[in-house]
Interface confidence: medium
């Protein structure tokens, strides 16, 4: 069957997100991938969206992220925009109202996004073959 257009959009957004570092991509987020053995795909997407929402809600106005130069300001703005888009698309793919995020493990946002990109690419290769 054909790949969902949302999945393509997610991969595109993740490619953009992982292309350049910002002041805040080294900050940590809950690592939902550390122990996701008995988690459904929909739950994983839902929990990833929750983690991203927590991140941008907390750091959108963070002066450390906004930086001290116009370039840093615009880069952070771009990061938040992409995270919001990713959040929206992941919710759409998950189709769940809510999901708990209780893991203690942490990873940097950068690593979290790279891991999510790997998962999404794997899913895409399966549905496009």
């Amino acid at each position: 069957h054909k790949c969902d257009i949302t999945l393509q959009e997610i991969i595109k957004t993740l490619n953009s997100l992982t292309e350049q570092k910002t002041l805040c991509t080294e900050l940590t987020v809950t690592d939902i991938f550390a122990a996701s053995k008995n988690t459904t795909e929909k739950e994983t997407f839902c929990r990833a969206a929750t983690v991203l929402r927590q991140f941008y809600s907390h750091h959108e106005k963070d002066t450390r992220c906004l930086g001290a130069t116009a370039q840093q300001f615009h880069r952070h703005k771009q990061l938040i925009r992409f995270l919001k888009r990713l959040d929206r698309n992941l919710w759409g793919l998950a189709g769940l109202n809510s999901c708990p995020v209780k893991e203690a493990n942490q990873s940097t946002l950068e690593n979290f996004l790279e891991r999510l990109k790997t998962i999404m690419r794997e899913k895409y290769s399966k549905c496009s073959s």
Epitope: K61, T63, L66, G67, A68, A70, F73
Partner: antibody
Framework: EVQLVQSGAEVKKPGASVKVSCKAS????????MHWVRQAPGQGLEWIGV???????YYADDFKGRVTITRDTSTSTAYLELSSLRSEDTAVYYC???????????WGQGTLVTVSS | DIQMTQSPSSLSASVGDRVTITCKAS??????AAWYQQKPGKAPKLLIY??SHRYTGVPSRFSGSGSGTDFTLTISSLQEDFATYYC?????????FGQGTKVEIK
Amino acid sequence: EVQLVQSGAEVKKPGASVKVSCKASGYTFTDYSMHWVRQAPGQGLEWIGVIFQSGATYYADDFKGRVTITRDTSTSTAYLELSSLRSEDTAVYYCARGGIFYGMDYWGQGTLVTVSS
Amino acid sequence: DIQMTQSPSSLSASVGDRVTITCKASQSVINDAAWYQQKPGKAPKLLIYYTSHRYTGVPSRFSGSGSGTDFTLTISSLQEDFATYYCQQDYTSPWTFGQGTKVEIK
């Protein structure tokens, strides 16, 4: 209610400096950037510069070296200082709050600065 | 710097008319375009931000569209909207405005 209240009109001689203030209320001052924009009589809007949430500033090339934007977080007031004034600087100067990322969502009432010998 | 070029520079219209103003950026600004309305002697007011998002309290007759380099402000049915309209990009520094479009009564 968000409000930006600017200082009163100024008349200056060429070569002098002017400092315009913009007092903010109704929101957390340091959560938003503050822009300064001017409008010469009968002309369009011209962006001058911005002071970011962090306190860092960025100026349009046309004003670099002549403009200084500062703020006093204790009084939630932003300032625009323009030096070496010339007649072409006669304009209404506006402060405008930067939306978190998009647009300038609240504007001061404007301050008319007249440069005349 | 990114130039924002508006057209037309002025137009005459009647109450109830549909009015379209366009703005062309000299390079892509993605979706980072805003529109303002300014009435004589008053400060500008934000109408549309991020290309198509109506600002709080702005009537639904105002809409924005476009992406990349081409943006449009549409007033579906002109009311007491006779004013000058400005587009602006906040994609990158320096922030820049279009030269304005004056909407006058026919």
